[in-house]
Amino acid sequence: TPEVWVQVRMEATELSSFTIRCGFLGSGSISLVTVSWGGPNGAGGTTLAVLHPERGIRQWAPARQARWETQSSISLILEGSGASSPCANTTFCCKFASFPEGSWEACGSLPPSSDPGLSAPPTPAPILRADL
């Protein structure tokens, strides 16, 4: 069964700057990744970035840099200034659309006990939705 993992990290150098990393553990080819915050995409969440493996990347504030890390994982750096900046308990979600598996989404937030610059290892987060 495919899985999605989400890792959220607060940068030690900028306490209001976050890095979100997401990955897809499955055999299919990824056609699209959508990163949102405040809940799952389409369920109250606000889209931060949409990444297509070949067409390109679209991102919106406070997202600063979205990029592919590997063919099945992405990272997103968030600026931390102004009213739209994230806070420690913000939920971030990643939805991977893959062929032939369908869509798989998982969410994560900053581990409550983590120090700035530290984070939990990138273990699979609970899968919230699998739209086949």
Partner: antibody, heavy 114, light 113 residues
């Protein structure tokens, strides 16, 4: 079938504003950004910016910041581009586009003339 | 901003012959993480909107004839029409799809010799 249908040609006076609409169909309007691109007569393509209808998040080309506003109405799957303080150099065909420029509207000619 | 420079500005090729258009970017368009080049090619005929031909530097958009092909990596890219047809007369643009703002080349006008 994905379609982007734009409003008709406009003739405007210098200093005024113009609002161009782009009605989308055939896909989930809120999921992909609507890009705005303009093309002056005989010239190349110039990206003005984009809006993500689902969240009304925007990105603007610095060249147009402060003069252009993008909005979107999810209920009618329509995006809008408003350009203010028009000058003769703004005479161009304005296009909306979506899904990484794979789909385009037919274009709207805006003529700025006194 | 990434500057896209196309060459030549205009090109005349005989029907059935090969047409080649070059595009150079001021910065690399290669995403090292997934080894994909974020470059697109468009065709525009008079009075029409641009039409996407190629994305990811070499992937043909659905419905585009296989005589159109894209190649290149990093900062140097090429659009090739293997056997020119009359309907290929148009202006061709390359585009940076790597970073904001998306920027286009100045265009290459392709005509029949």
């Amino acid at each position: 079938e994905v379609q982007l249908v734009q409003s008709g040609a406009e003739v405007k006076k210098p200093g005024s504003s113009v609002k161009v609409s782009c009605k989308a169909s055939g896909y989930t309007f809120s999921s992909f950004s609507i890009e705005w691109v303009r093309q002056a007569p005989g010239q190349g393509l110039e990206w003005m910016g984009e809006i993500l209808p689902g969240s009304n998040s925007t990105n603007y080309n610095e060249k147009f910041k402060g003069r252009v506003t993008f909005t979107a109405d999810e209920s009618t799957s329509t995006a809008y581009m408003e350009l203010s303080s028009l000058r003769s150099e703004d005479t161009a065909v304005y296009y909306c586009s979506s899904y990484w420029f794979a789909y385009w509207g037919q274009g709207t000619l805006v003529t700025v003339s006194s | 901003d990434i500057v896209m420079t196309q060459s030549p500005d205009s090109l005349a090729v005989s029907l059935g012959e090969r047409a080649t258009i070059n595009c150079k970017s001021s910065q690399s368009l290669l995403n090292s993480g997934n080894q994909k080049n974020y470059l697109a090619w468009y065709q525009q005929k008079p009075g029409q909107p641009p039409k996407l031909l190629i994305y990811g530097a070499s992937t043909r958009e659905s419905g585009v004839p296989d005589r159109f092909s894209g190649s290149g990596s990093g900062t140097d890219f090429t659009l090739t029409i293997s056997s020119l047809q009359a309907e290929d007369v148009a202006v061709y643009y390359c585009q940076n799809a790597h970073s904001y703002p998306p920027t286009f080349g100045q265009g290459t006008k392709l005509e029949i010799k």
